[in-house]
Every structure is written in structure tokens, then in C-alpha cells.
Interface confidence: low
């Protein structure tokens, strides 16, 4: 029988025993920073090389007895989960272990830093294929540990870490809070967040995704053929490290940004019961459970996007929150959200040569979040077009006027404390769908991108009666790049993307005024890239999809009709 | 403890001459900051990671560490450089009294200092 966790990470329609090849992950080296390990365990012998690196604090307590099997317990189990012959995710991955945790499972930030430095030096001395570093540990928020992780990630290393077992916001812990690290929370066989005693898995915006982390069968250091069940976010992180090794083995050239986007894309969506999380964390916590991709061939033809939430701005009147994309990603849209509804919108602005998404709090507001939609769009050239407040009854509008640029997102920002409910017309002039429309007192920002084969369309879902949530989703084959609300009136709490769905939240219906005021429209911008699809087809030498272009052409929406008259 | 006392004697002798000509003022610009773990039981006072500015070379890191030892020795404090970082972050790990933090923050090239803290298997 296949352990539940290996079954769970196997894509639907596949059997885990057939799907997981014995050489999966063979081109990848996984570094494990943990306790000592029992390297001659049958699950991992010959697969794990114990380095001579050791940096651990003394064990606490005078009555502590160092027992080899206890000292090795945590690390041995995790090595087995990553690459074990029998119960491992990436059975072909080779591993290297560094001892940074003592026999009580305790280490130091400094010891971990020196371990990361050791890995970097090893990489420089003897460059190998893709590297994955598994950090199944957590401490309090550490600027220096996060900085070291950032540097290692920028050197091309994929870092995977445990979100932490404190039933708390993962952003309060390191390395879980490092944006460059892939942070993993734990779920159980019922896809519920894992409870560990009185605590449980961490959650929040610093978690990238969840993975199996309860009752995970793996190598036990009690004997060379023993198995044991362990639970925790370390086990969850080990699954993702294994999945990452499998993906990198299939596509060794994947960047960290591409790998993260794929992990998110292939995850099971919306299966976690969010009621387990504190109410204020539910919207911030990704509802994703990691899974292997359904094919070892790349998925390079897809336009991948993910949602990145900022930290909370705090309640001061002029407070702002900033959400950033990873260096290799494009910011295609920006939105904002406030639980109190008091906000002054959001704008895309340049910072250090890159676009960021900034949300603005309003007087009396409890604070805002900025929400960035971050996408992988090779050879993209994106810019922001801004229209100042129109001061006219028609409302403010802005479009992408450069030839070949398409609209990927709309943002609006206002200086007035309360926009009131003066509604601009929701309907756009026909033939000009590539425009952002907003309140007349707001400045409007259009994200306009040029990329080979990129095409986008606007989808709207309007509800005349007040409703707490309005959603609109992009159809199969299209990716949500932009999510905003029309109109930007005061009862709209904000808009954000959840996977391929644009969600617009409004104040509790009981607090809103008349039904006419309650009308809300969710506006999604859905894009796809013909260029990526064609490149992928050429790469796979496939002719079976020859009809794709005709379908694309038939469905294509031409944004620039008014330009064509001039040629 | 005996070893450390031995180190101390050695440091005072080896570094005092070097210390005299060194200015204590930091480079122009922002003042270095101090960080420590928000979770008190996880703090490890007495050991500090001194992080230097991004483009600092290894030789400068070593020189800054020696400077700290010399200045501390002059004030009668024992310090021990446990590790000099290079490859990921420039800086060094030092065992010293918290009394020396103010002095360490004023050293040239220092970006920030973080008190060491515990991490745990999850």
C-alpha cells in the first residue's frame, strides 16, 4: 500500500507507485541542514552523503544522555521523506547533510548561517547541477538569516523551509519569513491544517503552499530497517523539496521564480478548510496543497501568475503597504484590501528599477494590504499609464496607447478620504476594451505590457444588489493577471486574485445603504501567451496541436482596432 | 575558562599597537542598527553576528573584527571572533559582552548587528 502522503502529491488520474520513478530527481542535489543522520539506514544508504559540517550548541540540562538514535531521529526521517527508496518523494535525488541541530533538535542562527555559507562555498568550488536546500527548522524573525537566504537564492539555489509549528503567523519566524525561500505549511490526510498538541502549522502570507505533514511514514533511526511516523512542517517542507528535485530534474534550467510558480500552479486548490486559521489570516493564507506536475515535460507554454500580499500597513493615516514581485517576475497588476473599507486605493510605482504595488490607508482606517499579481512573462516590456482625477461626471479613464501593448491590470488611487458613491458609468465605449475606468476623483493606473504573443481580455461580473463577495474567473487556458472593482466606492473593501479568480469584497450587506449603492462589479483581466505555447510546441516537436493557432485566432480579441486605421 | 584567559592576554599584546591609530567613527551615512529575537527565551546574548555593508571584502571584515577586539581589549573586555563570514554575507561572529554593542555599532563598514538566537527542528 502506498502511504497517504505519496498518494496525495501524485497528480489525479495517476497511481503513485507507477508515477514516482526510481530515478526521480537524479540530476539534483538536496542539502539538508538538520540533526545528524543515520546514513546507513536502508531507506537512504548510498543516497545521503554526510558532510563534515557540524555547528551545534551544547545540549541543555545536566541529565541529558546522548543517544545516537535520538540524535539522528529528525534528520534521518526527513532524508527518507525526500529521497527514501521506499517512502521517499524523489527516489533518485542525492543528498548531503549538514549538522546544525543538536540531539535535542536545537541549533542557532549563527550555526545555520555558517552552514549556508558552507553550501555556497561548496557550490563555488565544485559547481554541480541544480541545488535544493532544505531548512526544516525555525527560529524567531531574523534579519541576518533572511538576508543569507536571499543571497543564496540569488546565487541560483532553491531554498525550501518549514513554516513553523507554532500555530502563528509564519512571518514572525525565520527563515520562513524570507521572501526568496519557499515556505511550506502542513496539512493532514483530510487536507486540514495540522494540529500539533496545542499548537499546529503556521499560516499567513509568508507561507507559499502546504504539503502533507501529519502521520508521515519515513526512516526511523531506531534501526537500519525501521520506519516511524512523524508530523510537522519539516515533513511538509521535505515533500516540497522532493517535488522541487523532481521538477528540476525534468527541467534543470528552471529559475527559482519559475519553480515557485509551477509549484503553485500544480498544487491542489481550495481543499484546505480555512476555518482552522484565525479569521484575519484566512484571506492571506494560500489554499494550496503541493503536488507533482502531471507530466515530467515542462509546462513552459503557460502564463504563470501568483498573488503576493504585502505586510499590513498599520493604522496611521498616511500608512502604506508595499507588495513586491520576485526579481524574475513582472508585476502585471496591483490591488488593495482593507477590512474596514477605509483605504485610498493603490498604485503601481517604480522602486529601484522595478515596479512595486503600493496601497494607501485612509483616515480612521485600521490599515491596508497591497496585493501584487506577479507573473512570468519572458521578454516583457511593461509600463504604467496614469490618468489624473477627471473631475468630470464621466469618471477617469486610461488606456494602453502604445502599439502592441495590452492591458494587464488596473489600479486606482485617491487622495480624498471618502470617495462617496458617485458612480462612474460602468459600461465602456464599444471597441475600446483596453481601458481602465475609475471614479472621477481617483487617479487611474493602467499596467500596459508588450510581450511576444501576449493577448488579454476583460471579463466582468456585476451584481446590482449588495453582496459581500463578487467573483469572476478566467476560463481554461487563460490566466488572471488583473483584478479590480467597479466602482471604487467606499463600501468596497478591495479586490484580490485567488488562483484564477478575481474576488471583490464589500462591506457587510447590513451596513451598506440602498441597493443601488450596493452594486459592485468584479473586473478580471485574463491573458495568455501564444508565443509561449508555440515555443513549447516547437520544443516538444509536436504537430498534434496544429489546430491550436486557428482556435487562438478565432478567439482573439484585437485591442488596437483604432490603431489599425492609420496603417 | 583558562583557554579564554590565555586568548585574552594574547589579544591585548597583539592588538594594542594596531588599535592606536584607528578612528572609531563610522563611515558617513546611516547609523548601524541592532536587532535581537523578539522571543525572549530564544535569545542567546553574548554572541553577535556583525553584518558589514554589502561590498565589504574579506580583508576588511577581518580588519574590522580585529579593530573591535582591540577597542574591547583597551576597555578591559575579552572578545572572541568565532567565525569570519564571506561568500554569502560579509561580517563576523563574535563572542563578547553586550556592553560593547554601542562601540561595535560605530565601527566602519557595519550595516547591522544581530544577537544570536536559537532555531528549532520543526
Amino acid at each position: 500500500s502506498i502511504p497517504w502522503n505519496l498518494e496525495r502529491i501524485t497528480p489525479p488520474r495517476y497511481r503513485a507507485d507507477e508515477y514516482q520513478p526510481p530515478d526521480g530527481g537524479s540530476l539534483v542535489e538536496v542539502y539538508l541542514l538538520d540533526t545528524s543522520i543515520q546514513s546507513d539506514h536502508r531507506e537512504i544508504e548510498g543516497r545521503v552523503m554526510v558532510t563534515d559540517f557540524e555547528n551545534v550548541p551544547e545540549e541543555d540540562g545536566t541529565r541529558f544522555h546522548r543517544q545516537a538514535s535520538k540524535c539522528d531521529s529528525h534528520g534521518t526521517h526527513l532524508a527518507g521523506v525526500v529521497s527514501g527508496r521506499d517512502a521517499g518523494v524523489a527516489k533518485g535525488a542525492s543528498m548531503r547533510s549538514l549538522r546544525v541541530l543538536n540531539c535535542q533538535g536545537k541549533g542557532t542562527v549563527s550555526g545555520t548561517l555558517i552552514g549556508l555559507e558552507f553550501i555556497r562555498k561548496s557550490q563555488l568550488v565544485q559547481p554541480v547541477g541544480p541545488l535544493v536546500v532544505l531548512l526544516p527548522l525555525a527560529g524567531g524573525y531574523s534579519r541576518v538569516l533572511n538576508a543569507a537566504c536571499q543571497r543564496l537564492a540569488r546565487a541560483g539555489v532553491v531554498l525550501v523551509t518549514a513554516a513553523g509549528n507554532f500555530r502563528d503567523d509564519a512571518c514572525l519566524y525565520s527563515p520562513a519569513s524570507a521572501p526568496e525561500v519557499i515556505t511550506v505549511g502542513a496539512t493532514n490526510a483530510q487536507d486540514q491544517p495540522v494540529t500539533l498538541g496545542t499548537l499546529g502549522t503556521n499560516f499567513g502570507r509568508c507561507v507559499d503552499l502546504f504539503a502533507p505533514g501529519e502521520d508521515i511514514i519515513g526512516a526511523s533511526s531506531d534501526c537500519s530497517t525501521c520506519f516511524v511516523s512523524q508530523s510537522g512542517t519539516s515533513q511538509a517542507a521535505a515533500h516540497v523539496a522532493g517535488i522541487a528535485a523532481m521538477m528540476l530534474s525534468a527541467e534543470p534550467e528552471l529559475t527559482l521564480a519559475e519553480l515557485r510558480q509551477r509549484l503553485i500552479h500544480f498544487s491542489a486548490k481550495d481543499v484546505i478548510n480555512e476555518a482552522w486559521f484565525p479569521e484575519d489570516q484566512r484571506v492571506l493564507t494560500p489554499n494550496l496543497v503541493a503536488a507533482l506536475p502531471p507530466s515530467t515535460h515542462g509546462a513552459g507554454w503557460q502564463l504563470f501568475c501568483r498573488t503576493v500580499w504585502s505586510a499590513h500597513s498599520g493604522p496611521t493615516r498616511m500608512a502604506t503597504a508595499v507588495a513586491r514581485c520576485a526579481p524574475d517576475e513582472e508585476l502585471l497588476s496591483c490591488s488593495s484590501f482593507s477590512r474596514s473599507g477605509k483605504r485610498r486605493g493603490e498604485r503601481m510605482e517604480a522602486q529601484g528599477g522595478k515596479l512595486v504595488c503600493r496601497a494607501h490607508n485612509a483616515f480612521g482606517g485600521e490599515g491596508v494590504y497591497a496585493i501584487a499579481r506577479c507573473c512570468l512573462l519572458p521578454q516583457a516590456n511593461c509600463s504604467v499609464h496614469t490618468a489624473p482625477p477627471a473631475e468630470a461626471s464621466m469618471g477617469t479613464r486610461v488606456h494602453c496607447h502604445q502599439q502592441g501593448h495590452v492591458l494587464t491590470g488596473c489600479s486606482s488611487h485617491w487622495e480624498v478620504e471618502d470617495l462617496g458613491t458617485h458612480k462612474p458609468p460602468v459600461l465602456r465605449p464599444r471597441g475600446q476594451p483596453n481601458q481602465c475606468v475609475g471614479h472621477r476623483e481617483a487617479s487611474i493606473h493602467a499596467s500596459c505590457c508588450h510581450a511576444p504573443g501576449l493577448e488579454c481580455k476583460v471579463k466582468e461580473h456585476g451584481i446590482p444588489a449588495p453582496q459581500e463577495q463578487v467573483t469572476v474567473a478566467c476560463e481554461e487556458g487563460w490566466t488572471l493577471t488583473g483584478c479590480s472593482a467597479l466602482p471604487g466606492t467606499s463600501h468596497v473593501l478591495g479586490a484580490y486574485a485567488v488562483d484564477n479568480t478575481c474576488v471583490v469584497r464589500s462591506r457587510d450587506v447590513s451596513t451598506t445603504g440602498s441597493t443601488s449603492e450596493g452594486a459592485v462589479t468584479a473586473v478580471a483581466i485574463c491573458c495568455r501567451s501564444r508565443h509561449l505555447a508555440q515555443a513549447s510546441q516547437e520544443l516538444q516537436g509536436s504537430t498534434s496541436g496544429s489546430g491550436l493557432n486557428d482556435i487562438f485566432e478565432a478567439q482573439k480579441i484585437e485591442w488596437h482596432e483604432h490603431h489599425h486605421h492609420h496603417h | 575558562q583558562e583557554d579564554e584567559d590565555g586568548d585574552y592576554e594574547e589579544l591585548v599584546l597583539a592588538l594594542r599597537s594596531e588599535e592606536d591609530g584607528l578612528a572609531e567613527a563610522p563611515e558617513h551615512g546611516t547609523t548601524a542598527t541592532f536587532h535581537r529575537c523578539a522571543k525572549d527565551p530564544w535569545r542567546l546574548p553574548g554572541t553577535y553576528v556583525v553584518v558589514l555593508k554589502e561590498e565589504t571584502h574579506l580583508s576588511q571584515s577581518e580588519r574590522t573584527a580585529r579593530r573591535l577586539q582591540a577597542q574591547a581589549a583597551r576597555r578591559g573586555y575579552l572578545t572572541k571572533i568565532l567565525h569570519v563570514f564571506h561568500g554569502l554575507l560579509p561580517g563576523f561572529l563574535v563572542k563578547m559582552s553586550g556592553d560593547l554593542l554601542e562601540l561595535a555599532l560605530k565601527l566602519p563598514h557595519v550595516d547591522y548587528i544581530e544577537e544570536d538566537s536559537s532555531v528549532f527542528a520543526q
Partner: antibody, heavy 121, light 112 residues
């Protein structure tokens, strides 16, 4: 068919070393771990250790740890067991036996014919 | 180390007899994940190499006659020969592979 063919009998003096070979045929050498088991005259079977031919990883029984070396040459599908500092107690038949490298197949399904090593002054 | 104790150390029987050999281990050989007992039985004839009969305590190796059967779990195991044949007179060994490998001291089965 699957076969493990061992080298011929050896007579050694105390303090000397002996190296026994085991040539595999009829299967993929690196897919199976190679174990060594010995049997003193009129006695039972005693496990000495194993080598994983694919990785070269070895594991020795505590009793032999300091004296035994197991190696392999994958190019000729041969495993070797060398025992040093021989005493008369090492007089025995030495067997190689294969074990499939998978999940929980920890049994020896094919054995060599055995090599008699006699230690005598 | 796990200690394997076989009994009896020798026994005499006739062709057609039903014979039972027992093997006790000093600790459980049941693997919690696979629910398999890591115990095997081998037969050895004088001057010959051992031959695998039973693995996982009760699974017969291919080509082994069905008069040989294995049973037991945890620490107590049995090898049964339902109807002795002339070629079955040999020495039988149990072997644990739960933690490294240990053989029992052997049971010599002789013609009465």
C-alpha cells in the same frame, strides 16, 4: 542464468590477508547489493557485511569492522571481500549472496558456491 | 544486536512426517510501515550453499515446493514441512533482516 561464481580455495598463514572474488552474471550487477556470509567448519552462518555496487557504500558487522574491506569493480561485475590479520578462527567457507536493492527485499535469493579459506601456520 | 534462537538444534524424523522448527527473535521483526516481518528461512545441504525457502516470514520463494510453509509474526516464527521428502533432510536457518542481519544457530534435520 543468474550465477555468482567465487574464486578458488585459499590457504593462508596467520597474520596474512585473503581476498575473495565473486563474479556476477545473468543480471544487472548494480541492481543488487552483495553480502558476504561465512561458515566455520560445523558451525552456523555468520553475516559479515554488504556492499552496494551502484554507490560503493559498505556496511560491516561490528565483529569484522576493523579487518574487512568490501569493494567492487562494476566494469567486470565482480565484488571482492578482503579479510586481513587472519587467525585460525577465520578458517571457514566464505559465501557471497545477492539481495535486490528495493523497498523491503532484505533476503538473499542467490548464493555463490563458497570459497574455502584455511588459515594454518 | 538482535539474537535469533532456533529450536530444536537437531531433530530426527521420517519421510512423510510433519515437521515444525521454531525461531524466536529478541525483538519484534514486524515493520510498522509495510506490515511485513523481516524474517527468512534457508535450507543448507552438506557441502552446498544455503538456499532461500521463505521470506517475509510466510512468502514462499518461487520454485520452492508448497509442503514448505512459514508462519508467525513479531518475535515467534515457525517453519513447517507438511510431509517430509528424502531431499528435505538438511540444516535449516532462520535469519532476521530487521536490523542488519543475524542467523539462527540452525536446526539439523536427520533421517530417523
Amino acid at each position: 542464468q543468474v550465477q555468482l561464481v567465487q574464486s578458488g580455495a585459499e590457504v593462508k598463514k596467520p597474520g596474512a590477508s585473503v581476498k575473495v572474488s565473486c563474479k556476477a552474471s545473468g543480471y544487472t550487477f548494480t541492481d543488487y547489493w552483495m553480502h558476504w556470509v561465512r561458515q566455520a567448519p560445523g558451525q552456523g552462518l555468520e553475516w559479515m557485511g554488504y556492499i552496494n555496487p551502484s554507490s560503493g557504500f559498505t556496511k560491516y558487522h561490528q565483529n569484522f569492522k576493523d579487518r574487512v574491506t568490501m569493494t567492487r569493480d562494476t566494469s567486470i561485475s565482480t565484488a571482492y571481500m578482503e579479510l586481513s590479520r587472519l587467525t585460525s578462527d577465520d578458517t571457514a567457507v566464505y559465501y557471497c549472496a545477492r539481495q535486490y536493492d528495493y523497498d523491503e527485499d532484505w533476503y538473499f535469493d542467490v548464493w555463490g558456491q563458497g570459497t574455502t579459506v584455511t588459515v594454518s601456520s | 544486536d538482535i539474537v535469533m534462537s532456533q529450536s530444536p538444534s537437531s531433530l530426527s524424523a521420517s519421510v512423510g512426517d510433519r515437521v515444525t522448527i521454531t525461531c524466536k527473535s529478541s525483538q519484534s521483526l514486524l515493520n510498522s510501515r509495510t506490515r511485513k516481518n523481516f524474517l527468512a528461512w534457508y535450507q543448507q545441504k552438506p557441502g552446498k550453499s544455503p538456499k532461500l525457502l521463505i521470506y517475509w516470514a510466510s512468502t514462499r520463494e518461487s520454485g520452492v515446493p508448497d509442503r514448505f510453509s512459514g508462519s508467525g509474526s513479531g518475535t515467534d516464527f515457525t517453519l513447517t514441512i507438511s510431509s517430509l521428502q528424502p531431499e528435505d533432510f538438511a540444516t535449516y536457518y532462520c535469519k532476521q533482516s530487521f536490523n542488519l542481519f543475524t542467523f539462527g544457530q540452525g536446526t539439523k534435520l536427520e533421517i530417523k
